[in-house]
């Protein structure tokens, strides 16, 4: 989390930012919050991005001010107009890439003063797992794979029965990039399982954790999945 | 160039099935946003479904749980299987591609014509 | 759910002239996220304008568009035979996530 304060003549007014992080090919969010004015003509929203000359995104008098947009953000940026009001500065962003990584600054003026506050923003590709039983292997085996991942994650495979055992022995993780040459699908087999077991495939990488749950018994396979952001300190 | 060529349409039943295909050139269809958007005879456009970059897929409430978009990225190329179709489906589908600022790139069409 | 509402339906006019299409929509849309299509008969459309003003590649400078919140503009300066169509707002975001307005037919006078 980075609050940040204002400076100069006017009086301050606290920014509040949080570090995220951007799957790409998706929508991506920059979280901004600031003290609300009553008059939202009074509110100015400007987003800026270190090394970047032209604005990402202004805001101001109640509507869009585009004209002086960098071409690389053109098209592909929003405010929720409708949330400005009560303090909500986070900027929409459309088809996140990996050039879209960077450190970005929320500014804000009201007519109580200005603020600004700065917002690391990493991104990469996440996505959830499935782990599923291989009845194609000669010994019972699991295949954890998951459809895209960037930059390389690491898997770790875990069992609720043999908890702390190392089973990087008994696995096998490949990567294999996508077609569209920077995202990679993750594909991991343990070998040797027993029934009666439930077993955790992780995948982590500095952006997000994911992990796959199966659980094998004789009669039933259940599976649950999740996934986190990691890195999300407010500033 | 750049281009977008869809096929697989035709005339089929109430409740019947049909799989329409988009295939790209000149771009890498995973890297956009990819829709369907159709238009009814005399009709203006509607927008079906998209599939994001990622691979995760939204659509119109109106074909939520009969049409599901799709893509092979090995073949560059778009889908859209339509299961349970009604005549209010008979439409030309478009595909386009949107490059973050708007659907720059649209293929001819394809006519669906859903009637007994 | 926005819904985008275009005026008029159907705008006669002769070459020459200047025509002025209306776009409004039912809450705030992004300037970013607003594009403008003209559709020729048997034709797909074609996109003219993104980011509400932005002309979109090889896109005569006769076109123009405007606007922010919920009312949005495209002008044709200078009316060619050429531009005579049907002409779509759209924008995206909100749910459904693409929305289109239901068309300006520009007919010759």
């Known amino acids: 989390l980075i609050i940040g304060f204002g400076i100069s003549g006017r009086h301050s007014i606290t920014v509040t930012t949080v570090a995220s992080a951007g799957n790409i090919g998706e929508d991506g969010i920059l979280s901004c919050t600031f003290e609300p004015d009553i008059k939202l003509s009074d509110i100015v929203i400007q987003w800026l991005k270190e090394g970047v000359l032209g604005l990402v995104h202004e805001f101001k008098e109640g509507k869009d001010e585009l004209s002086e947009q960098d071409e690389m953000f053109r098209g592909r940026t929003a405010v929720f107009a409708d949330q400005v009001i009560v303090g909500n500065a986070s900027l929409r962003l459309k088809n996140v890439q990996l050039t879209d990584a960077g450190t970005y600054k929320c500014y804000i003026i009201t007519s109580k003063g200005k603020g600004n506050a700065n917002l690391e923003y990493k991104t990469g590709a996440f996505s959830m797992p499935e782990v599923n039983v291989d009845y194609n292997a000669s010994s019972e085996t699991l295949r954890c794979e998951a459809p895209r991942w960037f930059p390389q994650p690491t898997v770790v495979w875990a069992s609720q029965v043999d908890q702390g055992a190392n089973f990087s022995e008994v696995s096998n993780t490949s990567f294999e990039l996508n077609s569209e040459n920077v995202t990679m699908k993750v594909v991991s087999v343990l070998y040797n399982v027993t029934i009666n077991n439930t077993y955790s495939c992780m995948i982590e990488n500095d952006i997000a954790k994911a992990t796959g749950d199966i659980k094998v018994t004789e009669s039933e396979i259940k599976r649950r999945s999740h996934l986190q952001l990691l890195n999300s300190k407010a500033s | 160039e750049v281009q977008l060529v869809e096929s697989g349409g035709g005339l089929i039943q109430p409740g019947g099935s049909l799989r329409l295909s988009c295939a790209a050139s000149?771009?890498?269809?995973?890297?956009?946003?990819m829709n369907w958007v159709r238009q009814a005879p005399g009709k203006g456009l509607e927008w079906v479904s998209v599939i994001y970059g990622s691979g995760r897929t939204d659509s119109a409430d109106s074909v939520k749980g009969r049409f599901t978009i799709s893509r092979d990225n090995s073949k560059n190329t778009l889908y859209l299987q339509m299961n349970s179709l009604r005549a209010e489906d008979t439409a030309v589908y478009y595909c386009?591609?949107?490059?973050?600022?708007?659907?720059?790139?649209w293929g001819q069409g394809t006519t669906v014509t859903v009637s007994s | 759910e926005i819904v985008l509402t275009q005026s008029p339906g159907t705008l006669s006019l002769s070459p020459g002239e200047r025509a002025t299409l209306s776009c409004r929509a039912s809450q705030s849309v992004s300037s970013s996220y607003l594009a403008w299509y003209q559709q020729k008969p048997g034709q797909a459309p074609r996109l003219l304008i993104y980011g509400a003003s932005s002309r979109a590649t090889g896109i005569p400078d006769r076109f123009s568009g405007s606007g922010s919140g919920t009312d949005f503009t495209l002008t044709i300066s200078r009316l060619e035979p050429e531009d005579f169509a049907v002409y779509y707002c759209?924008?995206?975001?909100?749910?459904?996530?693409?929305?289109f307005g239901q068309g300006t037919k520009l007919e010759i006078k």
């Open positions: 000149g771009f890498i269809v995973s890297r956009n946003y």
């Open positions: 386009a591609r949107d490059a973050d600022y708007g659907m720059d790139v």
């Open positions: 759209q924008q995206y975001g909100s749910s459904p996530l693409y929305t």
